[in-house]
């Protein structure tokens, strides 16, 4: 029949119609950085070119013998899943096949690098359209793997690579942890993260999304026409670089932030089972699994954005962690987040002639994360304003005073270490939409934008008392692009988006034997653009 | 013979050369750093990569790869140029002793080195 | 293993009722349409009926509209059929099939069940 | 009356090449893609061909499918005594209902 994984990748039809998806890939090169492979394979015959680029190391031990069938196997697998005739994704695709790995799927570095260098020349001595590069390969951490990685990808190249199988935080691997890179952990038919062996996909904020990776049934090299299943992050990786071009070869303008950001967008939400990841890493963790869009049009009016999260600080008292986005994201707002909820805040500020979201940690804090909401917001312009703490007054506030300059974002920073020990502000008046408010003895800052068509609203939903979790959500065709709480006091633990909507934690009152006066509340900023609808519906 | 790429494939056990002078010493202040793979097995220790700054031009990375080889065939070391990058990363590929990168870290222009490592099919 | 076992066939007389039910496994049965495709006895086979994924549309071959009710419970992973007012001309094996997001075609059947009307 | 025209019957002997052709109109095959089925008797119909010209895995490549305009046909090359069935085309129609072929038997001499 029609594999589960095909079917699994392809959006789920809202019209009795057929579903048409974008260009098969056709004016997409994707490179594989792999094993050999059997390039007369039925699957992938006509469609794979063989370079001549071969960097590998020695095969282990005296007695190894190089068997074609076993030397070709992965890569032969992936090449079908990204473009075989029958099992593959991208069926229009062409696929050029640099030999970087030996007949035990081994490599190196050095190897790896010298790989990506002979990419960038072939596209300097014959520029051609949009090239996707895959790299079902994983290392330990590579500082230069990691820059070779993001030079590739401010050149146009989109990277996509497998999260690894090593049951880890992906951040630990490269080039799995490179930001510019898309990174694709596995998950199977039932939507569970993909176990193997007494290991399995690797998971984290390094990781973009999911997609199938067990049981793929692709082009073998035992025979011509033969089929095997396989499975692992490699597998999912080459899922996603196919319908990364089919998705370039329907919009070959696409940037590499765009391409991110609908992959993002157009993924299955919330169906994999988080429980299988370890208890620290699922709130890190993307709950995403790729699919192609559900049409070639109506995309481009969207706003786009997605959750980033930092490294963790540290425990020391001063930690800092610092969220950036992709270079042509614009950061609409920036919160944190703290396991024991001892932080002191966020505040978006200017580095390297761009805005980052750095997140304090506080005395006797395990530390924090900062969260950034990145978002595709052409011809922005964004500016932070900042009120210091008001002291005497009930809460301080500030708001976006220019003209045209909207509200996407508060956050909240103090040096007090527990803000829990002080009265609690009152929430923002009704009516004052362009307002950040918060605690007394914390700075409030504004992030206040100005583009095209854009308005932006506020939402809320407060509880009495402290329950573990406060949520609110963007209604359909605004996207979020703000999430906070209020009030600021020890009790909540941080606030973050999750797809479109907000998330404030709060420590259990139940735990914490607090009164109900203590309310907290969700508080979203949804945002949509006039001008990119408008636009958008002008092309069509 | 160099190809047009600069891959160096011969072995230097050179007189001390021109080159090896202090001509060109790192700048004040900043210190070159040393990388390896955390994962001890997958380390390939006696390959490394030399990155080095930015800006660096294929000529200068050539002259900094012939430099490490002039001065670490003084102290009697024998190393092999594998490849010079250019059009990603400046830098190079070189397979010696571990025992010179404290010499390599002090080279004009040197952004940091890695140890080579192990990747794997996933 | 995918797998769609219809039941609820049987001999029943013109003008009766019979409601056909189809248990899926194997799936995310919630996230595709599915259609019920009959074949009478030595001939082709007909297209009877389709429900999208949430149950919110539903189309119907001429000749069963006002009499036959396509209906779905997710929860279940359950498709029905309920066929009223049955004329001779329903005679024929019903089929219940998965209607494929990726090929846009019937890419799993079950075995089928056996609906005879006749007095 | 089948919306989609099939011929009734076809045959070949072992190793010949088949054509089933299947003809429709702008509402169907002229602006959908079509499928073909396969049914042993006394078996559920099999998925063969969809989108024109895609197989689902485990079906040989000796059977092709394609398109041209309001028709479309199917191709089984090197013929095997195993491929003796039913064939049906069927596509999506503009009026919101599956349309399919009559079906035409197809005997292995």
């Known amino acids: 029949s029609i594999p589960w994984n095909l079917e699994r990748i392809t959006p789920p039809r809202y019209r009795a119609d057929e579903y048409q998806p974008p260009d098969g890939g056709s004016l997409v090169e994707v490179y594989l950085l792999d094993t050999s492979i059997q390039s007369d394979h039925r699957e992938i015959e006509g469609r794979v070119m063989v370079t001549d680029f071969e960097n590998v190391p020695e095969e282990d031990g005296t007695r190894f013998h190089r068997q074609a069938s076993k030397c070709d196997s992965h890569g032969t697998h992936l090449a079908g899943v990204v473009s075989g005739r029958d099992a593959g994704v991208a069926k229009g695709a062409s696929m050029r096949s640099l030999r970087v790995l030996n007949c035990q799927g081994k490599g190196t570095v050095s190897g790896t690098l010298i790989g990506l260098e002979f990419i960038r020349k072939s596209q300097l001595v014959q520029p051609v359209g949009p090239l996707v590069v895959l790299l079902p390969l994983a290392g330990g951490y590579s500082r230069v793997l990691n820059a070779a990685c993001q030079r590739l990808a401010r050149a146009g190249v989109v990277l996509v690579t497998a999260a690894g199988n090593f049951r880890d935080d992906a951040c630990l691997y490269s080039p799995a942890s490179a930001p510019e890179v898309i990174t694709v952990g596995a998950t199977n038919a039932q939507d569970q993260p993909v176990t193997l062996g007494t290991l399995g996909t690797n998971f984290g904020r390094c990781v973009d999304l999911f997609a199938p990776g067990e049981d793929i049934i692709g082009a073998s090299s035992d025979c011509s026409t033969c089929f095997v299943s396989q499975s692992g992050t490699s597998q999912a990786a080459a899922h996603v670089a196919g319908i990364a071009a089919m998705m370039l070869s329907a919009e070959p303008e696409l940037t590499l932030a765009e391409l991110r950001q609908r992959l993002i967008h157009f993924s299955a939400k919330d169906v994999i089972n988080e429980a299988w990841f370890p208890e620290d890493q699922r709130v890190l963790t993307p709950n995403l699994v790729a699919a192609l869009p559900p049409s070639t049009h109506g995309a481009g009016w969207q706003l786009f954005c997605r959750t980033v999260w930092s490294a963790h600080s540290g425990p020391t008292r001063m930690a800092t962690a610092i969220a950036r986005c992709a270079p042509d994201e614009e950061l609409l707002s920036c919160s944190s987040f703290s396991r024991s909820g001892k932080r002191r805040g966020e505040r978006m500020e200017a580095q390297g002639g761009k805005l980052v979201c750095r997140a304090h940690n506080a005395f006797g804090g395990e530390g924090v994360y900062a969260i950034a909401r990145c978002c595709l917001l052409p011809q922005a312009n964004c500016s932070v304003h900042t009120a210091p703490p008001a002291e005497a007054s009930m809460g301080t506030r500030v708001h976006c005073h220019q003209q045209g300059h909207v509200l996407t974002g508060c956050s909240s920073h103090w040096e007090v270490e527990d803000l829990g020990t002080h009265k609690p502000p009152v929430l923002r008046p009704r009516g004052q939409p362009n307002q950040c408010v918060g605690h007394r003895e914390a700075s409030i800052h504004a992030s206040c934008c100005h583009a095209p068509g854009l308005e932006c609203k506020v939402k809320e939903h407060g509880i009495p008392a402290p329950q573990g979790q406060v949520t609110v959500a963007c209604e359909e065709g605004w996207t979020l692009t703000g999430c906070s709480a209020l009030p600021g006091t020890s009790h909540v633990l941080g606030a973050y988006a999750v797809d479109n909507t907000c998330v404030v934690r709060s420590r259990d009152v139940s735990t914490t034997g607090s009164t109900s006066e203590e309310a907290v509340t969700a508080v979203a900023i949804c945002c949509r653009s006039r001008h990119l609808a408008q636009a958008s519906q002008e092309l069509q | 013979q160099e190809d047009e790429d600069g891959d160096y494939e011969e072995l230097v056990l050179a007189l001390r050369s021109e080159e090896d002078g202090l001509a060109e010493a790192p700048e004040h202040g900043t210190t070159a750093t040393f990388h390896r793979c955390a994962k001890d097995p997958w380390r390939l220790p006696g390959t490394y990569v030399v990155v080095l700054k930015e800006e660096t031009h294929l000529s200068q990375s050539e002259r900094t790869a012939r430099r490490l080889q002039a001065q670490a065939a003084r102290r009697g070391y024998l190393t092999k140029i594998l490849h010079v990058f250019h059009g990603l990363l400046p830098g190079f590929l070189v397979k010696m002793s571990g025992d010179l990168l404290e010499l390599a870290l002090k080279l004009p222009h040197v952004d940091y080195i890695e140890e080579d490592s192990s990747v794997f099919a996933q | 293993e995918v797998q769609l076992v219809e039941s609820g066939g049987g001999l029943v007389q013109p003008g009766g009722s019979l409601r056909l039910s189809c248990v899926v496994s194997?799936?995310?049965?919630?996230?595709?349409?599915m259609s019920w495709v009959r074949q009478a006895p030595g001939k082709g086979l007909e297209w009877v009926a389709n429900?999208?994924?949430?149950?919110?549309?539903?189309y119907y071959v001429d000749s069963v509209k006002g009499r036959f009710t396509i209906s779905r419970d997710n929860a279940k992973n359950s498709l029905y059929l309920q066929m009223n007012s049955l004329r001779a001309e329903d005679t024929a094996v019903y089929y219940c099939?998965?209607?494929?997001?990726?090929?846009?075609?019937?890419?799993?059947w079950g075995q089928g069940t056996m609906v005879t009307v006749s007095s | 009356q089948s919306v989609l025209t099939q011929p009734p019957s076809a045959s070949g002997t072992p190793g010949q090449r088949v054509t089933i052709s299947c003809s429709g109109s702008?509402?169907?095959?002229?602006?959908?893609?079509v499928n073909w089925y396969q049914q042993v008797p006394g078996t559920a119909p099999k998925l063969l061909i969809y989108?024109?010209?895609q197989r689902p895995l485990g079906v040989p490549d000796r059977f092709s499918g394609s398109k041209s305009g309001t028709s479309a046909s199917l191709a089984i090359s090197g013929l095997q005594s195993e491929d003796e069935a039913d064939y049906y085309c069927?596509?999506?129609?503009?009026?919101?209902?599956?349309?399919f072929g009559g079906g035409t038997k197809l005997t292995v001499l």
């Open positions: 069927a596509a999506w129609d503009d009026s919101l209902n599956w349309v």
């Open positions: 989108r024109n010209n």
């Open positions: 429900i999208k994924q949430d149950g919110s549309e539903k």
């Open positions: 194997g799936f995310t049965f919630s996230s595709y349409w």
């Open positions: 702008s509402s169907n095959i002229g602006s959908k893609t």
């Open positions: 099939a998965r209607e494929s997001n990726w090929g846009f075609a019937f890419d799993i």
